[in-house]
């Protein structure tokens, strides 16, 4: 479906409001340091140009690609060189190299101030004064901090954000109404960003085949009644959508996502019985709902997998004729029977099956060679099962905060070179697996836990890639996408690590800790814990627990004192001395 003017085509398909929002997201994800006003100006210029193309598709420059139009616009920013340094060199390149260059300069951890939430009355006034600017600012602030956020989904978040303010700013108790909603949006937003980051990493670092394999497994679990052909079609379309969004082609991505939702709803009879409610919703809610829909029930009477993939005399013939299609069928058949497995486990099984066929189909007696292939799956299945069982027991025993601390110690000992803020952030998120997944029955624990851990470990991988400091992290992150978690689990204490010099300043605390929220206070304590382990990697659990208990008592005592600052200064010195003695520093 070639269009004379791509920009006119997308403007007409998406409508002005979505067009402007998506262009703003795209620009903010590329130029993460630019002020809001500059982006709004660029977006307005692009929108006015798009309107001229809608009026006359043959008008000057209307035939240019979106990358060319958007790239040219970004390259008009006057302060590009001083704000972004070498990113300005992208502007000397031609498309498609220029866009690739912009993509490579996306920063997963931009040096931006933390978003501080103003008072509710201040927010409500701003919302009422200029609703459009208020919502644009939300898109801008999220997009620049999360340069891979799934753009059509961000439109859905913005819609909910608007609804929250519309409802709560006229409520009797504005804060009681609004704050829980904003907390929920923030937490869901962070989770959504991290999930999408893994999809983009999968596509960009491991290629389309890796993403398609993931999609076959996940969609087969979700739509077990759908035929292989149907799943294959959905996988192809979904891959296109995510390739576009991860590549910065946000208008095409949003348009194609809408088409995919339309197709799924028009064909729900042959896809899933669980889609009815989703398909009655408006577009943004519909797409979100489909993406989160529960797994359909498995069809009755599915035969044993062995008949097709072990016992059949045609296994090697089928494999040789179309390797990826046959492996896709294996993954489809296995995944639809196993909603209780994580996607990454299913992909490990498929990889094992592929490796076995590669070896056995060249052997003298192929059938004899691959006859026991399913036996090789047993340890692969048991490993995550046992790990989840052990960690859920630990979580139930300790509670979330102390479970996070156990993981902080574990991961700091594995990869002590990683920066303290990254170790704290990643370990805190790893620790959330407990409250997120351990409440589930056995059949839902593994897909919840291991696929969540894949998302969190990807955060570690992308943050580490920016400033690599550990060969072990690089190795686990780059060797195999599906084996990242087992790779990190298998790491022992890094014996090559030279302990960090002791610095009393790291363990000096002030009265400001008393006014922090519980979460911020936890982060302070967890930061100190990581630093302790970096100073004394061989410290035992008991030693670390004793020091942390003393530390908690010290903070509690000084926060109750009349002269807090003096207490922190004097008692802090004693605590540092006692800790040094306890740990033999």
């Amino acid at each position: 479906d070639a269009h004379k003017s791509e920009v006119a085509h997308r403007f007409k398909d998406l409508g002005e409001e979505n067009f402007k929002a998506l262009v703003l997201i795209a620009f903010a994800q590329y130029l993460q340091q630019c002020p809001f006003e500059d982006h709004v100006k660029l977006v307005n210029e692009v929108t006015e140009f798009a309107k001229t193309c809608v009026a006359d598709e043959s008008a000057e420059n209307c035939d240019k690609s979106l990358h060319t139009l958007f790239g040219d616009k970004l390259c008009t920013v006057a302060t590009l060189r001083e704000t972004y340094g070498e990113m300005a060199d992208c502007c000397a390149k031609q498309e498609p190299e220029r866009n690739e260059c912009f993509l490579q300069h996306k920063d997963d951890n931009p040096n931006l101030p933390r978003l501080v939430r103003p008072e509710v009355d201040v927010m409500c006034t701003a919302f009422h004064d200029n609703e459009e600017t208020f919502l644009k600012k939300y898109l801008y602030e999220i997009a620049r901090r999360h340069p891979y956020f799934y753009a059509p989904e961000l439109l859905f978040f913005a819609k909910r954000y608007k609804a929250a303010f519309t409802e709560c700013c006229q409520a009797a108790d504005k804060a009681a109404c609004l704050l829980p909603k904003l907390d929920e949006l923030r937490d869901e937003g962070k989770a959504s960003s991290a999930k999408q980051r893994l999809k983009c990493a999968s596509l960009q670092k491991f290629g389309e085949r890796a993403f398609k394999a993931w999609a076959v497994a996940r969609l087969s679990q979700r739509f077990p009644k759908a035929e292989f052909a149907e799943v294959s079609k959905l996988v192809t379309d979904l891959t296109k959508v995510h390739t576009e969004c991860c590549h910065g082609d946000l208008l095409e991505c949003a348009d194609d996502r809408a088409d995919l939702a339309k197709y799924i709803c028009e064909n729900q009879d042959s896809i899933s019985s669980k889609l009815k409610e989703c398909c009655e919703k408006p577009l943004l809610e519909k797409s979100h709902c489909i993406a989160e829909v529960e797994n359909d029930e498995m069809p009755a009477d599915l035969p044993s997998l062995a008949a097709d993939f072990v016992e059949s005399k045609d296994v090697c013939k089928n494999y040789a004729e179309a390797k990826d299609v046959f492996l896709g069928m294996f993954l489809y058949e296995y995944a639809r029977r196993h909603p209780d497995y994580s996607v990454v486990l299913l992909l490990r099984l498929a990889k094992t099956y592929e490796t076995t066929l590669e070896k056995c189909c060249a052997a003298a007696d192929p059938h004899e060679c691959y006859a026991k292939v399913f036996d090789e799956f047993k340890p692969l299945v048991e490993e995550p099962q046992n790990l989840i069982k052990q960690n859920c027991e630990l979580f139930e025993q300790l509670g979330e905060y102390k479970f996070q601390n156990a993981l902080l110690v574990r991961y700091t000992k594995k990869v002590p070179q990683v920066s303290t803020p990254t170790l704290v952030e990643v370990s805190r998120n790893l620790g959330k697996v407990g409250s997120k997944c351990c409440k589930h029955p056995e059949a839902k624990r593994m897909p919840c836990a291991e696929d969540y851990l894949s998302v969190v470990l990807n955060q570690l991988c992308v943050l580490h890639e920016k400033t690599p400091v550990s060969d072990r992290v690089t190795k686990c992150c780059t060797e195999s996408l599906v084996n990242r978690r087992p790779c990190f689990s298998a790491l022992e204490v890094d014996e090559t690590y030279v302990p960090k010099e002791f610095n009393a300043e790291t363990f000096t605390f002030h009265a400001d800790i008393c006014t922090l929220s519980e979460k911020e206070r936890q982060i302070k304590k967890q930061t100190a814990l990581v630093e302790l382990v970096k100073h004394k990697p061989k410290a035992t659990k008991e030693q670390l627990k004793a020091v942390m208990d003393d530390f908690a008592a010290f903070v509690e005592k000084c926060c109750k004192a009349d002269d807090k600052e003096t207490c922190f200064a004097e008692e802090g010195k004693k605590l540092v001395a006692a800790s040094q003695a306890a740990l033999g520093l």
Partner: nanobody, 118 residues
């Protein structure tokens, strides 16, 4: 457009055998599980059997288990149903349909009639 052409039916005595065929066109045959269903005179549609995409895995209704065998030849886009030890209650119009154990209405071809009578 999806087309399924059944053949091989006929009149047979109880205890006899038949082999039904179904040639598929208009879709990627090897990417679909396939099924046979039947409709006895004056009755509703009854599922008979299904075969997996690859062709090794099969499933049968209790009423035909051990007597009927389903297979497929993906290279020829053809589905088969071998009917042995036929009984009078097997008398029906037999249709092949796309999909595993179909529990949603699907378009039917013209079918092939199997009559078991002495």
């Amino acid at each position: 457009e999806v087309q399924l052409q059944e053949s091989g039916g006929g009149l047979v005595e109880p205890g006899g055998s038949l082999r039904l065929s179904c040639v598929a066109s208009g879709f990627t045959f090897q990417h679909y599980a396939m099924s046979w269903v039947r409709q006895a005179p004056g009755k509703g549609l009854e599922w008979v059997s299904s075969i997996s995409v690859v062709g090794g895995g099969t499933s049968y209704a209790d009423s035909v288990k051990g007597r009927f065998t389903m297979s497929r030849d993906n290279a020829k886009n053809t589905l088969y149903l071998q009917l042995n030890s036929l009984k009078s209650e097997d008398t029906a119009m037999y249709y092949c349909v796309r999909g595993w154990h179909p529990d949603v209405p699907r378009p039917l071809g013209q079918g092939t009639l199997v009559t078991v009578s002495s």
